[in-house]
């Protein structure tokens, strides 16, 4: 009678993560008597995957009933496959021996490859905000995919970026891989509503790439422009001075009025108006009673935006240009929440 052969008909099997892998094996004879075992890998470090008679293998089921007297089908199914299951699986026939069973013949092996989807890309920007014309870096990470081949692209508002560097790790063979990419983006004043998108394409995604996004509103700081103007005379001894704070982002802003270098009032931007580009405008005003002043007044609008060093704009108010009420040194009453009189 011909010597027993162990046949593994599939040289390779490709399975998606989470699915069940079927590893086929048949023997050509019932002799010698002894069990079949499945191993991953060869040599002394091989891992036992299934032993017909002993051990706990909750993920493995047999395709046929191994207890049937004439059974020669030793195929197995392994459930809930993960990338860690990738490798070459050997169906090995043992013959009964004493004290231990002795390896008799091995199949040629079946290579199990696992396709695993990449995790959703996570995009992160710089820790601190930056101003227009500056270049900032964004990183994109995705993990757990297999095989190694993967494509990553960067977009800003739908326009593909070219200034980026990408690494896939590890370089050698692994059960699964990770991708890390860093893109450089030049900020503009219009970027409050902009998005940076990292797009990952992989064979497991069937042409439907995964995307991770970052809003540049989290990254950009648009500093304000200031304009101090003197409004027409409201009454013969009153002047309305306004400070226009324009095109700033984010909203966090504190304004201080100084009169001849002395703090007059400090307020925080509240009822701002939003521009189409996402930046904000705000206006503060002072009602100045010029009759309270003998000399010219230097009014300064000082703005601290988003914790940055203060910027300021000044306006010289000519007291001599306005007639004074004789004997009066009383300022006009406050007439609005944003109004303040200078004494």
């Amino acid at each position: 009678e011909e010597e027993l052969q162990v046949i593994q008909p599939d040289k390779s099997v490709l399975v998606a993560a989470g699915e069940t892998a079927t590893l086929r094996c048949t023997a050509t004879s019932l002799i010698p008597v002894g069990p079949i075992q499945w191993f991953r890998g060869a040599g002394p470090g091989r891992e036992l995957i299934y032993n017909q008679k002993e051990g706990h293998f909750p993920r493995v089921t047999t395709v046929s009933d191994l207890t049937k007297r004439n059974n020669m089908d030793f195929s197995i199914r392994i459930g809930n496959i993960t990338p860690a299951d990738a490798g070459t699986y050997y169906c090995v026939k043992f013959r009964k021996g004493s004290p231990d069973d002795v390896e008799f013949k091995s199949g040629a092996g079946t290579e199990l490859s696992v396709r695993a989807k990449p995790s959703a890309p996570v995009v992160s920007g710089p820790a601190a905000r930056a101003t227009p014309q500056h270049t900032v870096s964004f990183t994109c990470e995705s993990h757990g995919f297999s095989p190694r081949d993967i494509t990553l692209k960067w977009f800003k508002n739908g326009n593909e970026l070219s200034d980026f560097q990408t690494n896939v790790d590890p370089v050698g063979e692994s059960v699964s891989y990770s991708i890390h990419s860093t893109a450089k983006v030049v900020l503009t004043r219009e970027d409050v509503h902009s998005q940076v998108i990292c797009e990952v394409a992989h064979v497991t995604l069937q042409g439907d790439p995964l995307r991770g996004t970052a809003n540049l509103s989290e990254t950009i700081r648009v500093p304000p422009t200031l304009e101090v103007t003197q409004q027409p005379v409201r009454a013969e001894n009153q002047v309305n001075v306004t400070c226009q704070v324009r095109k700033f982002y984010p909203q966090r802003l504190q304004l201080t009025w100084l009169e001849n270098g002395n703090v007059s009032r400090t307020e925080t931007a509240s009822t701002v108006t939003e521009n189409k580009d996402g930046t904000y405008n705000w206006m503060s005003w002072l009602l100045v009673n010029v009759s309270a002043h003998r000399d010219d007044v230097k009014l300064t609008c000082q703005v601290e935006h988003d914790g940055q060093p203060a910027v300021s704009k000044s306006h010289d108010l000519k007291v001599s240009a306005h007639p004074k009420e004789q004997g009066s040194n009383t300022a006009a009453e406050n007439t609005g929440s944003n109004e303040r009189n200078i004494y």
């Epitope: 008597v33 002394p44 470090g45 091989r46 891992e47 036992l48 017909q52 008679k53 002993e54 051990g55 706990h56 293998f57 009933d65 191994l66 207890t67 009964k96 004290p99 231990d100």
Partner: antibody, heavy 114, light 108 residues
Framework: QVQLVQSGAEVKKPGASVKVSCKAS????????MHWVRQAPGQGLEWMGR????????KYNPKFQDRVTITVDTSTNTAYMELSSLRSEDTAVYYC???????WGQGTTVTVSS | EIVLTQSPGTLSLSPGERATLSCRAS???????LYWYQQKPGQAPRLLIY???NLASGIPDRFSGSGSGTDYTLTISRLEPEDAAVYFC?????????FGGGTKVEIK
Amino acid sequence: QVQLVQSGAEVKKPGASVKVSCKASGFNFEDTYMHWVRQAPGQGLEWMGRIDPADADTKYNPKFQDRVTITVDTSTNTAYMELSSLRSEDTAVYYCVRGNYVNWGQGTTVTVSS
Amino acid sequence: EIVLTQSPGTLSLSPGERATLSCRASSSVSSSYLYWYQQKPGQAPRLLIYSTSNLASGIPDRFSGSGSGTDYTLTISRLEPEDAAVYFCHQWYSYPRTFGGGTKVEIK
């Protein structure tokens, strides 16, 4: 569900024999080995031997080789362990254990005393 | 035969503490064949970890196993009062199958 139900406690004299039974249900009896493990009071676990119910092939711990016999009756899905020439140090709880090492019998206390 | 030596014999720790139990084999054991059991008084042993590092069904993930060759470890990351028991390692790599002498874990 899988169950291994063992026979009741036994008290034996030194030199006598004891036969403990283990009735299996809830799985294909011939699928896996059936082991016997014992535990003396306050002591560790000691593997005595195993049987393959499919063909009655046995393996024994050399320590018990001459005194232990493990058998099966596949018609009743029952495994047996017989220990002869009992001595006081054989006083222990005897467990039958399915080959997957997950399913254990409830244990049978054997007391050897003169 | 392969002799499995467990240490320490007794471990007395407080709830929330980390327990590290050692099992040393007299000759190399393939990690696929190294199992751990938990046994409480009056009960049969219960399979805790199989193939060195895999948690058996229903076992909380505070239990973990590691090792290779001759040195194996069972770790309980944060002890709970119900973890008070005796823990045994076991090899079925070669005949005769053997068990370690056990480590008793006491909760203070």
